[in-house]
Interface confidence: low
């Protein structure tokens, strides 16, 4: 498993190992999670042929995974710091149920899946400290999440593999967009 942020700051340019600023910590946390996702994707791709599936086939899923759109203010055109931060936090909160689903989906990378889940919780806390407009952040309904989790776990093997692949890919894309946007804040 990758070293948790803060334990090795070789990726952060701090000549005298000064304490990390809030934005450095967030940046490092996201990149740590992305490393974890890469490891999980490796196992998924080795185990099934989902990674070779065409994007069109993958798009034909009924998962409602969070995705950045122009209106969210996280792209260079129409960038809006407050709107974007709300979208990032809301999106991460929505991803939590999917990360819970991933917990029983890995054999050799079980620890890694747990690390991604826990690190995402920490990231959300970092971002909530940064956000001023917390009222605009809607927390997913626990009952809805519970029934979604049950539904996902009841799928056949092929659909579960597909779901795992889609979650990891979407989460990676969401984090990469978030990383770029947060570097402007």
């Amino acid at each position: 498993a990758p070293v948790p942020p803060g334990e090795d700051s070789k990726d952060v340019a701090a000549p005298h190992r000064q304490p990390l600023t809030s934005s450095e910590r967030i940046d490092k946390q996201i990149r740590y999670i992305l490393d974890g996702i890469s490891a999980l994707r490796k196992e998924t791709c080795n185990k099934s042929n989902m990674c070779e599936s065409s994007k069109e086939a993958l798009a034909e899923n009924n998962l409602n995974l969070p995705k950045m759109a122009e209106k969210d203010g996280c792209f260079q055109s129409g960038f809006n710091e407050e709107t974007c931060l709300v979208k990032i936090i809301t999106g991460l909160l929505e991803f939590e149920v999917y990360l819970e689903y991933l917990q029983n989906r890995f054999e050799s990378s079980e620890e890694q899946a747990r690390a991604v889940q826990m690190s995402t919780k920490v990231l959300i806390q970092f971002l909530q400290k940064k956000a001023k407009n917390l009222d605009a952040i809607t927390t997913p309904d626990p009952t809805t999440n519970a029934s979604l989790l049950t539904k996902l776990q009841a799928q056949n093997q092929w659909l579960q593999d597909m779901t795992t692949h889609l979650i990891l890919r979407s989460f990676k894309e969401f984090l990469q967009s978030s990383l770029r946007a947060l570097r402007q804040m």
């Epitope: 340019a13 701090a14 940046d27 260079q76």
Partner: antibody, heavy 118, light 111 residues
Amino acid sequence: QEQLKESGGGLVTPGGTLTLTCTASGFSLNAYYMNWVRQAPGKGLEWIGFITLNNNVAYANWAKGRFTFSKTSTTVDLKMTSPTPEDTATYFCARSRGWGAMGRLDLWGHGTLVTVSS
Amino acid sequence: DPVLTQTPSPVSAPVGGTVSISCQASQSVYENNYLSWFQQKPGQPPKLLIYGASTLDSGVPSRFKGSGSGTQFTLTITDVQCDDAATYYCAGVYDDDSDDAFGGGTEVVVK
């Protein structure tokens, strides 16, 4: 007038360390991504990585572990560890506007030549 | 890692003619348009011509035109001048910023 100037190049022995410095004048480095790019004699451009506004860094996959960036408000340093003769090149620093580090490299220094040889 | 493949060198064009250089990405660049073009003359640093696939940088003559999206991009120089003899590079930004890279370069010879 906005300018970038690299310094610190020269002859270095394989396995040694070398620090190159990029000095900005006419603008503050704190408002931009700053990139390092190199070019071996007679070869193409090779992007090494960048350091962001808030001091985060990203390196090209091939460059990870071989280079370290740091910066102040007027200088950006590139530290090379254990260079090999293949690292012989002119090293440029370049300023980037926009989000993608290489999305808009609008200001370049003239480069400093590093020769790795025993 | 993603690769940017440029038109093989050299490409020659007569003064007053038109030259096109292609740049093919092995996977889509960030937001489909994070691709720039640079001109480099011997002994000089590169000079930014175009960013965002098609936006001309300030001071660059309108004879230079960038087009394309996703994985396929083209730099077109119309009314070629002697001063345009140089090596041209494309550079791409990707979702993962560790993948950012330059193309191999294309030398333009003006006859």
